[in-house]
């Protein structure tokens, strides 16, 4: 009955500070409303990066000021986090909640280690 969530172990952010990964869940119920949350774990502290609730078959809608965007297809969510800097390197955990109809189910992935490398500044040209 427990819900399993799968996500890649490692992702390297692009030079523009964008990282994308797939979060897939094995739904034990027939949910119509799903909440997806990205958590960041650093030094045993867990913080929320972004969250979106969507109706199955519809697109994810994150808040306008969110650093996350995403699309959904069946039990799979494609997540993109932008604006990342080297200091944002860390473990990003995908949390999925089947909100409606009851019963509620929780699924938490093992996390994706996102590595972010700040680009070297361009050398001054004379």
């Amino acid at each position: 009955k427990a819900m399993h969530v799968a996500q890649p172990a490692v992702v390297l952010a692009s030079s523009r500070g964008i990282a994308s990964f797939v979060c897939e869940y094995a739904s034990p119920g027939k949910a119509t409303e799903v909440r997806v949350t990205v958590l960041r774990q650093a030094d045993s502290q867990v913080t929320e990066v972004c969250a979106a609730t969507y109706m199955m078959g519809n697109e994810l809608t994150f808040l306008d000021d969110s650093i996350c965007t995403g699309t959904s297809s069946g039990n799979q969510v494609n997540l993109t986090i932008q604006g990342l800097r080297a200091m944002d390197t860390g473990l990003y955990i995908c949390k999925v909640e089947l909100m409606y109809p009851p019963p509620y189910y929780l699924g938490i992935g093992n996390g994706t280690q996102i590595y972010v490398i700040d680009p070297e500044p361009c050398p001054d040209s004379d």
């Epitope: 009955k1 427990a2 819900m3 399993h4 034990p28 409303e33 949350t37 958590l39 867990v46 913080t47 929320e48 609730t53 949390k95 909100m99 409606y100 009851p102 019963p103 509620y104 189910y105 929780l106 699924g107 938490i108």
Partner: antibody, heavy 118, light 107 residues
């Protein structure tokens, strides 16, 4: 300091009503799901009801469904439990509890006692 | 509903001894299991979540293990303040359920 403080408990007759409140402080209340959990005298813990951060999703234990109503006011950092048609078996200490980001109930209030007796 | 069964009901031990508490689920809860400590007249306090991760501020003498249906809470060296009732809880699906508790008392 992260804190939850319950109030509103007391003695009520069978069939009566009571409204419990839980005041939250020290964290962004509007970002967390909240719960009510009760504990009858000398007994274990029993989950009663849950409400999502924006009140969109609400869940009840079968034992209270149709009699209890959970609600919240994010502007007031407060959680409520309206209890109607109270029975002797509802006698318990009622705790409000926050749902942590990873799922467990990570912060609990000190509890408020509800006694249903004629 | 997922039923959690804790054993033993009571554990009589002396300070400094090791305590091993068991929690068995009626069906798999994966690792969505927490342990709570409750002292008389106080609210429960989260000790362990995710079956094995210590909550903030919890001493390392407390450890959790297990997955699926069988879980264990171990207290390596009992301190006087550890004598209390311990509850397991599954939070992977509603209704959220608790075990009936294990009382750890001074022998």
């Amino acid at each position: 300091e992260v804190q939850l403080v319950e109030s509103g408990g007391g003695l009520v007759k069978p069939g009566g009503s009571l409204r419990l409140s839980c005041a939250a402080s020290g964290f962004t209340f509007s970002s967390y799901s909240m719960n009510w959990v009760r504990q009858a005298p000398g007994k274990g813990l029993e989950w009663v009801s849950s409400i999502s951060s924006s009140s969109s999703y609400i869940y009840y234990a079968e034992s209270v469904k149709g009699r209890f109503t959970i609600s919240r006011d994010n502007a007031k950092n407060s959680l409520y439990l309206q209890m109607n048609s109270l029975r002797a078996e509802d006698t318990a200490v009622y705790y409000c509890a926050r749902v942590g980001l990873m799922g467990p109930f990570d912060i609990w209030g000190q509890g408020t006692m509800v006694t249903v007796s004629s | 509903e997922i039923v959690l069964t804790q054993s033993p009901g009571t554990l009589s031990l002396s300070p400094g001894e090791r305590a091993t508490l068991s929690c068995r689920a009626s069906q798999s809860v994966s690792r969505y299991l927490g342990w709570y400590q409750q002292k008389p007249g106080q609210a429960p306090r989260l000790l362990i979540y995710g079956a094995s991760t210590r909550a903030t501020g919890i001493p390392d003498r407390f450890s959790g293990s297990g997955s699926g249906t069988d879980f264990t809470l171990t207290i390596t060296r009992l301190e006087p303040e550890d004598f209390a009732v311990y509850y397991c809880q599954q939070y992977g699906s509603s209704p959220w359920t608790f075990g009936q508790g294990t009382k750890v008392e001074i022998k």
